[in-house]
């Protein structure tokens, strides 16, 4: 018995039927990516983390979903206090507004 064709990774089971002269064979097949791997070819890596290399969870497609307070492609950039003037201030941890030299105030404005 042989079968040629694509079976994409998913949670559902796929039924394959084979009929011979004296027997009928039904197979239930499920292909699943290894943990932390995604996509049809299981080559997209996403492992949730919450440290200096990224603050994110992974959606069902393996895309990084930033945790509250973090942004950017790798979710490494902190979201500063709302209203912080980013021309004259910034932050390395969420919710702060640290002023550049020569600027002051709650929003560095």
């Amino acid at each position: 018995v042989s079968h040629a064709g694509m079976i994409n990774p998913e949670d559902r089971w796929k039924s394959l039927h084979f009929s011979g002269h004296v027997a009928h064979l039904e197979l239930q097949i499920r292909v699943r990516c290894d943990e932390n791997y995604y996509s049809a070819t299981c080559n997209k890596f996403c492992r949730p983390r919450n440290d200096f290399f990224g603050h994110y969870t992974c959606d069902q497609y393996g895309n990084k979903a930033c945790m509250d307070g973090w942004m950017g492609k790798e979710c490494k950039e902190a979201v500063c206090k709302q209203g912080c003037n980013l021309l004259h201030g910034g932050c390395t941890v969420p919710g702060e507004c640290r002023c550049s030299y020569g600027w002051q105030g709650r929003f560095c404005d």
Epitope: N36, R47, N50, D51, F52, F53, E74, T92, E96
Partner: antibody, heavy 123, light 107 residues
Framework: EVQLVESGGGLVQPGGSLRLSCAAS????????IHWVRQAPGKGLEWVGG????????DYANSVKGRFTISADTSKNTAYLQMNSLRAEDTAVYYC????????????????WGQGTLVTVSS | DIQMTQSPSSLSASVGDRVTITCRAS??????VAWYQQKPGKAPKLLIY???FLYSGVPSRFSGSGSGTDFTLTISSLQPEDFATYYC?????????FGQGTKVEIK
Amino acid sequence: EVQLVESGGGLVQPGGSLRLSCAASGFTFTSYDIHWVRQAPGKGLEWVGGISPADGDTDYANSVKGRFTISADTSKNTAYLQMNSLRAEDTAVYYCARNDYDVRFVGSGMDYWGQGTLVTVSS
Amino acid sequence: DIQMTQSPSSLSASVGDRVTITCRASQDVSTAVAWYQQKPGKAPKLLIYSASFLYSGVPSRFSGSGSGTDFTLTISSLQPEDFATYYCQQSFTAPPTFGQGTKVEIK
């Protein structure tokens, strides 16, 4: 048994280049970060940079940005630190370390370290 | 960058003593602090991660606590093999930064 083995250190002149290797074994290379940490003679620890071998994401300390490049060969389970435009202040023992993380915890920890390789920048 | 300031920079203690090392972050780092032990000529060893979790294989006399900006490493009963230098490290935001180290010497 988890092992990290550094190689490639030595004496180099200021402005020169050197490539360090970190050969990993005993664990799934793509499931962890590999970081480089250095220690100047008689001084403390300084993070140099790191890589996530699975996706190639890298980050660097400001002191080496633009001069050092970290890469990984997943077929060889090896990480590399390419050091260019070396300065006297880059003289240190360079360690590679595995960084383990778990989203249930805030932060991470470098749980396995290599033995270190000495890089001396001097004329 | 976030500064990690350890105190004291060195201390002398006897076997059996309770030893406390503190680490202060220049900004809030939640509980993202690890502690390492290093002996001369050797690589550092992880003791504590996420401020208070004991790493596998580390003796229970080591403990960590703290959150925000103030953190503590405690050795409840100092043993001969504990004489070493200890480093704290924040891993909350890039770049990860280490404290300057605390050398624990024999009194």
